[in-house]
Interface confidence: low
């Protein structure tokens, strides 16, 4: 809305007007003049600045000007005031009209002004404090110099006895809940009362009503009552003008994450409305606007420090649990066990949820994204994670069928990367999909749209449908290089496995046994020689390597990686009835990364000189980088059910120190 307005005077009348600081008033003196008038003069209070504008040229008028101006259609007045009035109608402008002859005015028009200051303020400079009347507050820009306020989706549950997230209702039960909201201050300054016929209104658009909620603390002195004033069915709220210098504090919560058809931007407006007459709508004479961007949901890559590790307790995974516990004890984080009453026999905790976070300058907290998979762990995120300063979000398809690709072993994120000069300081999301044109499985559109809409971790689609389970964590992971900001991409490689096995065969270890010491499997006595002589297995793994290479090329291109950034971990797959791949031996790339400590599926590879040659090989690749390898036996509790260590664990990590609003997507 233009920051200026026209006030119509009428000769023989006194007009009351409210002047909002920063909004010049234009007065058409010509239309207000009596027919006989030819010239006019002006008088005005000291606190009013008046300019006569003729044909675009402005001339300032002295306080009690004797000067007369010729009346013409192109002559208008421009009024400005520098400070708020202390009393209503205490400032005035008088226009005297003259005919051709006389010196005395033939008529007069009076404008009685009440100057008030109205400013709807937010933390537009993103320093965690609401500043006063930031000129950039109505727009939103990215980058380190960017301006515009930020809003969190209030998706945690600060009141434990409530069934859902805080943003699911229009109530505030605690001050803790308010801390998740962004502050907005309506500052007013002026006389004790306004002239009759004015009303101040806060409002939002219909399209924003399901995306933002606004609360007001009614009684900050005695026991507080939090009133929901905007959002959902409430599109506007009349604000009582209190007089003097006043600051009304509002709390704003996000209700929806950015998504398809919603950029994440919402605006809140305050208007001063003027009453004309019965049956005539109020008209806005001033509008101030603030714009918020709803903070995106951000995923955390392996390079970030862990806070807690989650794992399910099953009837058959006691030893696995013990090994994970030992690994976690080495790191500075806690182990959280999801017991059977909660997991109800579902061990795949990686597939049920993805940990991320949201952040604003004043606050941030972890948020779990619940997958549409909804296995027997489906109650876990809401019952065990959702809580004070721990948010929850989900996306469920309405018409699409949920497939294995909708599990979150198929949702990963890279460390920060630079691609052809473009930086992704929060990394890029990686999801598995089907081969172009193959008509195979694909992650459901609602989740893909959600991830895309967050903007800060531009997703990359990989090809994972060649796998039985079809998850990206079956062929890739990232590891940090301790003490640096660098990382390595680890990729499963059948070529690397064949190369290693051939080397061992050449060295005379062709009869080295895989799966040694494991009941059922070792009875088949699988040796290096047997693996290498199995033509169909070799052919299958050549095909699987092509699939891996297809992904390798995508990752190099989309993450700006070179061959030096990639480490190949030996892997073998075998084809199932549906011509898709499942791991032949525990798939080492499906590991858990906890700082420098890696929990790697124990591959039970060929025993060469009392040691597993796969373990030795992997240690040789990773330990020189400063990483510590712990091989975890998951074969009976996970591998045989088509998953490994990563699939059976989940890690809540610390957020990035980098602020998402400093980037330019």
């Amino acid at each position: 809305m233009p920051r200026e307005r026209t006030v119509r005077l009428q000769y023989g009348s006194r007009v009351e007007a409210v002047y909002v600081l920063g909004t010049p008033l234009w007065i058409d003196v010509y239309s207000a003049a009596p027919a006989e008038a030819r010239t006019f003069s002006l008088k005005h209070s000291e606190r009013v600045r008046v300019e006569v504008v003729r044909d675009g040229e402005a001339e300032e008028v002295a306080t009690n000007g004797k000067q007369r101006w010729l009346l013409s259609p192109s002559t208008t007045l421009r009024l400005t005031m520098g400070q708020a009035s202390t009393e209503a109608s205490s400032d005035k402008v008088t226009v005297n009209y003259y005919d051709e002859e006389g010196n005395a005015p033939i008529d007069q028009a009076g404008l009685f002004l009440t100057a008030i200051e109205i400013s709807l303020d937010v933390d537009a400079d993103r320093d965690g404090v609401v500043e006063k009347n930031n000129p950039q507050k109505a727009s939103w820009t990215w980058g380190p110099e960017g301006q515009g306020a930020i809003l969190l989706v209030n998706c945690d549950r600060d009141t434990p006895w409530l069934p859902k997230e805080d943003c699911s209702d229009e109530k505030v039960y605690s001050k803790e809940d308010l801390k998740d909201m962004s502050q907005m201050i309506l500052r007013t300054k002026g006389p004790d009362r306004l002239p009759a016929g004015y009303e101040m209104v806060l409002y939002i658009s219909v399209s924003d009503s399901d995306k933002v909620g606004v609360f007001y603390v009614e009684n900050p002195f005695f026991g507080q009552r939090y009133i929901h004033i905007l959002g959902r069915r409430k599109l506007y709220h009349v604000v009582k003008y209190t007089g003097g210098s006043a600051e009304l504090l509002f709390f704003v919560e996000g209700l929806r994450f950015p998504d398809e058809g919603f950029s994440g931007l919402v605006s809140i407006h305050v208007s001063l409305l003027e009453y004309m007459a019965e049956e005539v709508p109020l008209t806005p004479i001033f509008t101030d606007t603030v714009t918020f961007r709803i903070a995106p949901w951000i995923m955390t890559p392996n390079i970030l420090p862990p806070v807690s590790v989650f794992v399910c307790c099953m009837k058959d995974n006691y030893l696995f649990l013990k090994e994970v516990k030992n690994l976690v004890e080495k790191t500075n984080c806690e182990l959280k066990v999801c017991f059977q009453y909660m997991n109800r026999g579902d061990r795949w905790i990686q597939d049920e949820i993805e940990f991320g976070y949201i952040e604003a300058p004043h606050k941030g907290f972890p948020v779990v994204l619940d997958s549409p998979r909804d296995g027997n762990l489906k109650d876990f995120p809401i019952k065990q994670l959702l809580g004070p300063d721990f948010g929850y979000v989900t996306r469920e398809p309405v018409f699409e069928t949920v497939t294995s690709l909708d599990s979150f072993g198929n949702l990963e994120v890279s460390p920060p990367v630079t691609v052809n000069g473009k930086t992704y300081p929060l990394g890029r999301i990686l999801i598995g999909s089907s081969f172009p044109l193959s008509g195979g499985r694909r992650m459901t559109k609602v989740v893909r749209d959600f991830l895309q809409a967050q903007q800060v971790q531009a997703p990359v689609e990989l090809y994972s449908d060649w796998l039985t389970v079809g998850h990206v964590d079956e062929f890739m992971t990232f590891v940090p290089i301790p003490g640096t900001t660098q990382f390595r991409l680890l990729m499963a490689s059948t070529a690397a496995c064949y190369k290693l096995f051939r080397e061992k065969q050449k060295e005379g270890h062709g009869e080295a046994i895989l799966f040694k010491g494991l009941g059922g499997m070792s009875s088949k006595r699988i040796t290096i020689n047997k693996v290498l002589s199995n033509e169909s297995l070799a052919q299958e793994n050549q095909y699987f390597q092509r699939c891996l290479d297809w992904n390798r090329d995508i990752l190099k291109k989309e993450l700006g990686l070179t061959e030096q950034d990639i480490i190949d971990l030996p892997a073998l797959f075998k084809m199932d009835e549906g011509r898709q791949a499942r791991a032949f031996f525990p798939n080492m790339v499906n590991m858990i990364v906890l700082n420098k400590d890696l929990g790697i599926p124990k591959p039970f590879g060929p025993q060469v000189e009392e040691e597993c040659c796969l373990e030795t090989h992997v240690r040789g690749l990773l330990e020189p980088l400063g990483l510590a390898c712990t091989f975890i036996d998951d074969i009976s509790a996970y591998h045989k059910f088509l998953g490994e260590v990563h699939c059976g664990t989940n890690v809540h990590r610390k957020p990035f120190t980098f602020k998402w609003w400093h980037m330019v997507p």
Partner: antibody, heavy 121, light 105 residues
């Protein structure tokens, strides 16, 4: 159901201090202000002060500003009032009372049974 | 602070009689709450926000008033109504009236 439990009686020497307790149950302790009210034998009610258990923000009747100190222990859902430098004037029944801003227009909807404090040597 | 004066200090009533207890303020109060205190027990909320009955309170009790004058009416006194009645305002700092003792003849 909502209950505010207070000990029945306290006998205190003049000049000493006493810390009265009020254990809340049956509701979310941190969601309601806790008030303390004094009633001398055969007399009316006097508001002493109140505390918000969620953050210990408190307000006092000026007459009790130097006499009473209100605190809470959230972990045990207990409100406390310490009375210091006791004199015979402080002999009274002291009630804790929950204040409901939502359902009862700011009235005190639940009261403890009261603790009778006797100041005597 | 607002001073509340209750009258009468003592009221003796017969069973079935209608009675009115009054509470006047030395300056305008937003609204009034009323409490009943039976001998040896803690006060119990009777009426809140001038005219609203607290839960479980018999409908023979009613409240009214505004500004500086408020009243509590019992339409038909019963034996169990013998008690002290206190008015209470929460404008500025909270205060209570001195109380009215209701005795049954």
């Amino acid at each position: 159901q909502v209950q505010l439990q207070q000990p029945g009686a306290e006998l205190v020497r003049p000049g000493a201090s006493v810390k009265l307790s009020c254990k809340a149950s049956g509701y979310t302790f941190t969601s309601y202000w806790m008030n303390w009210v004094k009633q001398r034998p055969g007399q009316g009610l006097e508001w002493i002060g109140m505390i918000d258990p969620s953050d210990s923000e408190s307000y006092y009747n000026q007459m009790f500003k130097d006499k009473a100190t209100l605190t809470v222990d959230k972990s045990s859902s207990t409100a406390y009032m310490q009375l210091s430098r006791l004199t015979s004037e402080d002999s009274a029944v002291y009630y804790c009372a929950r204040k409901d801003y939502y359902a009862y227009g700011g009235a005190m909807d639940y009261w403890g049974q009261g603790t009778s404090v006797t100041v005597s040597s | 602070q607002i001073v509340l004066t209750q009258s009468p200090a003592i009221l003796s009533a017969s069973l079935g009689e209608e009675i009115t207890l009054t509470c006047s303020a030395n300056s305008s109060a937003r609204y009034m709450h009323w409490y009943q205190q039976k001998s040896g027990t803690s006060p119990k909320l009777l009426i809140y926000s001038t005219s609203n009955l607290a839960s479980g309170v018999p409908s023979r009790f009613s409240g009214s008033g505004s500004g500086t004058f408020y009243s509590l009416t019992l339409s038909s006194v019963e034996a169990e109504d013998a008690a002290d009645y206190y008015c209470h305002q929460w404008s500025g700092y909270p205060t209570f009236g001195g109380g009215t003792k209701l005795e049954i003849k």
